[in-house]
């Protein structure tokens, strides 16, 4: 029998490498059964994790599983860092595994390495 | 080096759909930060951000124009296309196409293309 | 939307001159503001980015300062191709946009 307890399927040690100033959107994998739960997200402030109030989030729902979604409009270099969610559920707190945004602050186009350079070192785009 | 162009009508008349090109050169719409969007500048006003177009396929839109435009890239061509749907005297501007990398920052603008609304 | 507000409107001033333009935000947007200038008949042409970060082809007569609601916008000794009108844009948050201008002119 599958169980009803709420799940967040944020795997261990996840990351996203996401270019500042494209839009983006940070997933939350949510399993419950019948009553959605009130789900939220935070950014991890050393040892603790500071809920993101006044951000703009929504819910996609598909067959067998939830996506509570952070959006990122657009992606902040400040916006680097560690985010967790958290699911409320019958006055239990369920809390998933960190996720990491590494965020490149590309310029502008005048420090757009050559086509050359790009060719032999195509990672100076990123720096 | 980066040149933009923007091409289309120059009159429309009243509720009519307005589409404009922007032809690039310079740089690919497939490479990662880049964006090229749209801004309009009716004579005499100030400037207006209508559309951008991200490397990634993203779009986003002026949330009070949204409903009347639609843009999209034909990344073969090096073209990117505003369509403006139901125009009005109000939306005589000059319309520009810009380049964008990082940061949305326009750094690389089209010469623009001065559109009338006018029956 | 972020509403854009910048002042004077217009400043009339001299060849050597030193002209400051201000330019606020009505919510915080960190550093992620750019300054234009634009000439007559011309396409805008990006000064400074990030605040105070200055274009590449952009002569250090042209400063930007600022984080948070207020900016400003130095051009330290005024030369005669300066003479334009400058816009900021906010790029913290969807949808961009500018300020209203400020026309530079000759005293």
């Known amino acids: 029998k599958e169980s009803c307890d709420v799940q967040l399927y944020i795997k261990r040690q996840s990351e996203h490498s996401i270019l500042a100033g494209d839009p983006f959107e940070l997933e939350c994998p949510v399993k419950y059964c019948a009553n959605r739960p009130h789900v939220t997200w935070c950014k991890l402030n050393g040892t603790t994790c500071v809920k993101l109030e006044d951000r703009q989030t929504s819910w996609k729902e598909e067959k067998n599983i939830s996506f509570f979604i952070l959006h990122f409009e657009p992606v902040l270099p400040n916006d680097n860092g560690s985010y967790r969610c958290s699911a409320n559920f019958q006055s239990n707190l369920i809390e998933s595994h960190s996720t990491t945004l590494y965020v490149t602050d590309v310029k502008s186009a005048s420090e757009r390495p050559s086509k050359d350079e790009m060719a032999s070192r195509p990672w100076l785009l990123y720096r | 080096q980066i040149t933009l162009k923007e091409s289309g009508p120059t009159l429309v008349k009243p509720t009519q759909t307005l589409t404009l090109t922007c032809t690039f050169s310079?740089?690919?719409?497939?490479?990662?930060?880049?964006?090229v969007g749209w801004i309009r500048q009716p004579p005499g006003k100030a400037l207006e951000w209508l559309a951008l177009e991200f490397w990634t396929g993203d779009k986003r839109y002026s949330p009070s124009l949204k409903s009347r435009l639609t843009i999209t890239k034909d990344t073969s061509k090096n073209q990117v296309v505003l369509t403006m749907t139901n125009m009005d005297p109000v939306d005589t501007a000059t319309y520009y196409c810009t380049h964008k990398l990082g940061m949305n920052y326009f750094d690389y603008w089209g010469q623009g293309t001065l559109v009338t609304v006018s029956s | 939307d972020i509403q854009m507000t910048q002042s004077p409107s217009s400043v009339s001033a001299s060849v050597g001159d030193r002209v400051t333009i201000t330019c606020r935000a009505s919510q915080g947007i960190s550093s992620w503001l750019a300054w234009y200038q634009q000439k007559p008949g011309k396409a805008p042409k990006l000064l400074i980015y990030a605040a105070s970060g200055l274009q590449s082809g952009v002569p250090s007569r042209f400063s930007g300062s600022g984080s948070g609601t207020d900016f400003t916008l130095t051009i330290s000794s005024l030369q005669p191709e300066d003479f334009a009108t400058y816009y900021c844009?906010?790029?913290?948050?969807?949808?961009?946009?500018f300020g209203p201008g400020t026309k530079v002119d000759i005293k």
């Open positions: 310079g740089f690919s719409l497939s490479t990662p930060a880049v964006g």
């Open positions: 844009q906010q790029a913290n948050s969807f949808p961009f946009t």
